[in-house]
Amino acid sequence: KFSKQSWGLENEALIVRCPRQGKPSYTVDWYYSQTNKSIPTQERNRVFASGQLLKFLPAAVADSGIYTCIVRSPTFNRTGYANVTIYKKQSDCNVPDYLMYSTVSGSEKNSKIYCPTIDLYNWTAPLEWFKNCQALQGSRYRAHKSFLVIDNVMTEDAGDYTCKFIHNENGANYSVTATRSFTVKDEQGFSLFPVIGAPAQNEIKEVEIGKNANLTCSACFGKGTQFLAAVLWQLNGTKITDFGEPRIQQEEGQNQSFSNGLACLDMVLRIADVKEEDLLLQYDCLALNLHGLRRHTVRLSRKNPIDHHS
């Protein structure tokens, strides 16, 4: 709980925000968890704390580890953990999966690609953008504020996009790069009221206590590109991100598939180390688009670890 993964490349700037949000201006103390050593606040240090931010200027592979932040007040201290991994720079063009931020989808009408994490940095426009390691050139590409706009998007525009910018700290400049995949959606088609293919309404899913369990929410919304379509899981009517149980997570990103020409999305709910209290929760698969929302409810039941065969 209150833990966040952050990653960066050696010799680049990396800025991490304390996962335990307070309000601005509160005192935040940072520690290197393995040694419980306090992170200095003096900016002359390569790694230093600045309020809710932990700054690596620049980062080194040896900086990898878990950092503890404590938002302090006289009556209520709040602790968070930043799991930081610094990787060596790749010699080739390929960006490995572990360096990729979440995938974004675009269409002819909407083709913004936001540069991940950029809001944490002190940067000035323009951003540099690369696709599959090639600098983007031509009038179709416009770097605007913290995002890239592609005019007249085509299927060929799908790929890995890297933004590169300079972070400035007290007159010193540090390079930062961040990469995410971009997929292109077909514009032609139609939209329907969502149809949930799985799970069935009021389905009972058998799980084993102590084991992992997966629930898949799958729904179709029409044919071709859908302007607004989403599937998600809720626990007791609350979004997974707000529910605050780290053992229960939605799979990052939604998979779009085309079944018999239909545009379908699925979202996998992963429950690690199933506990008794998980059986008491109501799991709702929600599918929504411009036509409305459909909900299928699932409950978990205990499955005996040993199956008895006659």
């Epitope: 335990r20 201006s25 006289p74």
Partner: antibody, heavy 117, light 111 residues
Framework: QVQLQESGPGLVKPSQTLSLTCTVS?????????WNWIRQPPGKGLEWIGY???????TYNPSLKSRVTISVDTSKNQFSLKLSSVTAADTAVYYC??????????WGQGTLVTVSS | DIVLTQSPASLAVSPGQRATITCRAS??????????MHWYQQKPGQPPKLLIY???NLESGVPARFSGSGSGTDFTLTINPVEANDTANYYC?????????FGQGTKVEIK
């Protein structure tokens, strides 16, 4: 958007127990923060009753501690106030509110509880 | 318990003028470089609304006409310039220790 809504009987008899519930939407109360009860007698100022934090740990105002219990129902995303042995002096508008650290940034609309026979 | 005393109990201000409310604590509410004093606005029939936290920090979405200052035991909420819809009760609250306490309130009326 975080929203809080108080509910419970508007009239309680003296010596009985006042019971109120605060239903939270837009945020899971077990995710983080502290969840407070505050009251305001008609035409008077505010009095902090106590809070329960995301982990279920409670802190009460010593002036009411012997009569107060704050608890949480995670399945309904609600937290509750019980105030025993009430008297007319407990007549007030009761508010629930969220504390990020120690100021209260989201409040319910409040519910008036009258103690009368 | 820390007792918070607000003054004046009420004041009437013309639109465009400055309104100043003070809050005095029975002991210091400052420690470790911060002052744990907060200000709320309460309009009739509504719950309080957080205006200022940590003595001088403007809560998100609150107009910059509101400002707070002070440290130790003496704190001030200033509204400048006052507008017609600022008619309300204003409360200070400390969080230096348990229990949290509020001031008795100051009623601001617009002439």
């Amino acid at each position: 958007q975080v929203q809080l809504q108080e509910s419970g009987p508007g009239l309680v008899k003296p010596s009985q127990t006042l019971s109120l519930t605060c239903t939270v939407s837009g945020y899971s109360i077990t995710s983080d923060y502290a969840w407070n009860w505050i009251r305001q007698p008609p035409g008077k100022g505010l009095e902090w009753i106590g809070y329960i934090d995301y982990s279920g740990s409670t802190t009460y105002n010593p002036s009411l501690k012997s009569r107060v219990t704050i608890s949480v129902d995670t399945s309904k995303n609600q937290f509750s106030l019980k105030l025993s042995s009430v008297t007319a002096a407990d007549t007030a508008v009761y508010y629930c509110a969220r504390t990020v650290i120690d100021s209260m940034d989201y409040w319910g609309q409040g519910t008036l509880v009258t103690v009368s026979s | 318990d820390i007792v918070l005393t607000q003054s004046p109990a009420s004041l009437a201000v013309s639109p465009g003028q400055r309104a100043t409310i003070t809050c005095r604590a029975s002991k210091s509410v400052s420690t470790s470089g911060h002052s744990y004093m907060h200000w709320y606005q309460q309009k009739p029939g509504q719950p309080p609304k957080l205006l200022i936290y940590l003595a001088s920090n403007l809560e998100s979405g609150v107009p910059a006409r509101f400002s707070g200052s002070g440290s130790g035991t003496d704190f001030t909420l200033t509204i400048n310039p006052v507008e017609a819809n600022d008619t309300a009760n204003y409360y200070c609250q400390h969080s230096r220790e348990f229990p949290f306490t509020f001031g008795q309130g100051t009623k601001v009326e617009i002439k």
